[in-house]
Interface confidence: medium
Amino acid sequence: VSPTFQVVNSIAPVQECSTQLDIVIVLDGSNSIYPWDSVTAFLNDLLERMDIGPKQTQVGIVQYGENVTHEFNLNKYSSTEEVLVAAKKIVQRGGRQTMTALGIDTARKEAFTEARGARRGVKKVMVIVTDGESHDNHRLKKVIQDCEDENIQRFSIAILGSYNRGNLSTEKFVEEIKSIASEPTEKHFFNVSDELALVTIVKTLGERIFALEA
């Protein structure tokens, strides 16, 4: 079966977010994420809820595995439609390592810079999606503190798929991904049983992101 899928589970009707936020989505693109189209379907369902534009919400996407790639910057696209088209084209870059701290740190230091479209005085939001314990977890505490110091609100999503498929304990992994999320953890941390289930959290995640500007 395909490494690429289009998840077509139906979700609740779109609720648009017309607030000012700078959102950077940090995607784990390592080999164990499968099927990748579950990730692009999740992006599609989340992004279509947003009112994207230079004076509204801006979205940038960073993908990491062994290395980090800026898929597109915050100021690259000026409408929801453009961002949706770009997000659909994001390919899985692979990698046998999951450098989560590197991904988050790169998002903080580079994606949230004015050169890449970040706006002064606009709330910064980071959404981290990953399916495995990081290979650089010794750096994670410092990286999260740096985000905290810069008032970056963090939502973290743990995909348990590769653990469930391998009958591995998820406890350590879940604790790590919880540590990435902003306080209160129960409002900023999500876990899904596998990649296909990502679309099921879109509505709640969207509502919690939009509530930041309430």
Epitope: P3, N31, R93, G94, R96, G161, L196
Partner: antibody
Framework: QVQLVQSGAEVKKPGASVKVSCKAS????????MNWVRQAPGQGLEWMGI????????TYAQKFQGRVTMTRDTSTSTVYMELSSLRSEDTAVYYC?????????????????WGQGTTVTVSS | DVVMTQSPLSQPVTLGQPASISCRSS???????????LHWFQQRPGQSPRRLIY???NWDSGVPDRFSGSGSGTDFTLKISRVEAEDVGVYDC?????????FGGGTKVEIK
């Protein structure tokens, strides 16, 4: 050894529903995705959808969206495929097939194990 | 959807002689991870499909080495070096690179 055993042949009337089962053995049920593929008489193979036995999440081919439901029972290592609003064109052999997987941080390789097939005949 | 086209539809062969089946895709099957997810299946009369070759050229366990797969991009070939009686059946290619997975129409191998 790894085996997928499907339920027996079914004869249904147009408009009815059919539920086909596929019992897995010889491997860790929750470690592999399961697919359903059908083959109408004299036709090629057609992929219908996939289910994750660990979480129960599904993805269906657009053609079957709204008519197909895939479920699983982890206690019996069984997956089910229910097709509703049957029409004569749904007359086919329905197969469950496992997605091959090379291990954690690995890759996925086609459909490596198949059930014996279940013949569904839709006729008034 | 990616269209997979097989030829010939039917391949009558003499026992002990070679056979070759072609499979073409409407777009490249190279995935972003560098792998090409093109697989070959054999379906003997009255039996379920059985995977012979995965990712273009890798044998499944128990598959005789008279079967071989080759190709790249959009053009792929399954070869049987010397056809035996047990090779009679339908051979299908399947792509798993693009959504949704699609199969070729099948090639029937029969003995002359």
């Amino acid at each position: 050894q790894v085996q997928l055993v499907q339920s027996g042949a079914e004869v249904k009337k147009p408009g009815a529903s059919v539920k086909v089962s596929c019992k897995a053995s010889g491997y860790t049920f929750t470690s592999y995705y399961m697919n359903w593929v059908r083959q109408a008489p004299g036709q090629g193979l057609e992929w219908m959808g996939i289910i994750s036995p660990s979480g129960g999440s599904t993805t269906y081919a657009q053609k079957f969206q709204g008519r197909v439901t895939m479920t699983r029972d982890t206690s019996t290592s069984t997956v089910y495929m229910e097709l509703s609003s049957l029409r004569s064109e749904d007359t086919a052999v329905y197969y469950c097939a496992r997605t091959g997987y090379s291990g954690y941080e690995g890759y996925y390789y086609g459909l490596d194990v198949w059930g014996q097939g279940t013949t569904v005949t839709v006729s008034s | 959807d990616v269209v997979m086209t097989q030829s010939p539809l039917s391949q009558p062969v003499t026992l002990g002689q070679p056979a070759s089946i072609s499979c073409r895709s409407s777009q490249s099957l190279v995935y972003s991870d560098g792998n090409t997810y093109l697989h070959w299946f054999q379906q003997r009369p009255g039996q379920s499909p059985r995977r012979l070759i995965y990712k273009v050229s890798n044998w499944d366990s128990g598959v005789p080495d008279r079967f071989s797969g080759s190709g790249s991009g959009t053009d792929f070939t399954l070869k049987i070096s010397r056809v035996e009686a047990e090779d009679v059946g339908v051979y299908d290619c399947m792509q798993g690179t693009h959504w949704p997975s699609t199969f070729g129409g099948g090639t029937k191998v029969e003995i002359k």
